[in-house]
């Protein structure tokens, strides 16, 4: 079949990084600059993807891959491709439309990204708070508090915390 | 909130250089990941898009307009100007300067209300 | 340049309606495709961004599909503040090029 298709149509001949080109005589021509086919048989080479402003070259344009973009320092990639760069926050903040804000008492977030979750409750697994959440750090939960030996306290568990996706205001 | 305001003459003749002030708040041009753009748009057609410029003073330009486009940036002053040499009667448009989408690129999320130039002898 | 182009240019349309208005690239432009609505006299103002990000304070009418060549506008239940012109803009690669619009028109 392959045979038979580049017999019939030259333009199959003309592999990933070239062009069929009809201006001149369907010979294979190289992709211009910033330009780039990725697979053979193409009529035209699609336009490289450029990475500028908030976005840097990850990977750069050849004749046969586009290029690939992520985010300058202090943005991450959000979206397919990463189609969008989200600035980064402090662990122990969220991102909200006015910028990085601290969690609210009884939740956290360990990365420089995403939304600050409520700490676990230890009590829902009839267990006891060993450590104590900060914005940065969820709980420790320890033994129930039926295991600990006579006398021994444990620290108390924490407020029922917010709803998750609930930015401070 | 963010808001912008051309500013500029509403008529100039051909081969003039017209000069158009983009005067904003609400944001610093001087903040990683701003930038702002010029769109125009002739009476009764699509938009078209002119230059940018990003807070770390990156331009880029319309191919086809290139040699004719300068685009500046005050930061203290709130302010990007644009200027465009040799105007012809085809360059008759509303010129919008617009705020990019914080984090995407050519993204215009926040317009002006636009400026009325019209090239007639 | 990537070329877009929009269909139908325009198109009338009753309030309550569902209306599509499509939007195709001259190449693959991932999901680097934004959508504005324009009145006359009016700027732009954008609504669906990354081919299907609502825009903050657009209604929920609104939404956007699509990635590669074929994007698509559905306004799920065309209201009386809907009637304008929309246009599809890539933001792929350097110059942003927007479709030559679609006039939504009272039937």
């Known amino acids: 079949f392959e045979r038979t298709r580049s017999l019939q149509d030259p333009c199959s001949n003309c592999p990933a990084g070239t062009f069929c080109d009809n201006n001149r005589n369907q010979i294979c021509s190289p992709c211009p600059p910033n330009s780039f086919s990725s697979a053979g048989g193409q009529r035209t080479c699609d336009i490289c993807r450029q990475c500028k402003g908030v976005f840097r070259t990850r990977k750069e344009c050849s004749s046969t891959s586009n290029a690939e973009c992520d985010c300058t320092p202090g943005f991450h990639c959000l979206g397919a491709g990463c189609s969008m760069c989200e600035q980064d926050c402090k662990q122990g903040q969220e991102l909200t439309k006015k910028g990085c804000k601290d969690c609210c008492f009884g939740t956290f977030n360990d990365q420089k990204r995403g939304i600050c979750r409520p700490w676990t409750n230890c009590s829902l697994d009839g267990k006891s708070v060993l450590v104590n959440g900060t914005k940065e750090r969820d709980v420790v939960c320890g033994p129930s508090p039926a295991d600990l030996s006579p006398g021994a306290s444990s620290v108390t568990p924490p407020a029922p915390a917010r709803e998750p996706g609930h930015s401070p205001q | 909130q963010i808001t912008l305001k051309e500013s500029g003459p509403t008529l100039v003749k051909p081969t003039q250089t017209l000069t158009l002030s983009c005067t904003f708040s609400g944001f610093s041009l001087s903040t990683s990941g701003m930038s702002v753009g010029w769109i125009r748009q002739p009476p009764g057609k699509a938009l078209e898009w002119l230059a940018l410029i990003y807070w770390n003073d990156d331009k880029y330009f319309s191919p086809s307009l290139k040699s004719r486009l300068t685009i500046t940036k005050d930061t203290s002053k709130n302010q990007v100007v644009l200027t465009l040499t040799n105007m012809d009667p085809v360059d008759t448009a509303t010129y919008y300067c617009?705020?990019?989408?914080?984090?995407?690129?050519?993204?215009?999320?926040?317009w002006g209300q636009g400026t009325m130039v019209t090239v007639s002898s | 340049d990537i070329q877009m182009t929009q269909s139908p240019s325009s198109l009338s349309a009753s309030v309550g309606d569902r209306v599509t208005i499509t939007c195709r690239a001259s190449q693959s432009i991932s999901s680097y495709l934004n959508w504005y609505q324009q009145k006359p006299g009016k700027a732009p103002k954008l609504l669906i961004y990354?081919?299907?990000s609502l825009q903050s304070g657009v209604p929920s009418r609104f939404s956007g599909s699509g990635s590669g060549t074929d994007f698509t506008l559905t306004i799920s239940s065309l209201q009386p503040e809907d009637f304008a012109t929309y246009y599809c803009q890539q933001s792929y690669s350097t110059p942003p090029t927007f479709g030559q619009g679609t006039k939504v028109e009272i039937k």
């Open positions: 990354a081919a299907s």
């Open positions: 617009a705020h990019t989408l914080w984090g995407s690129d050519d993204v215009f999320d926040v």
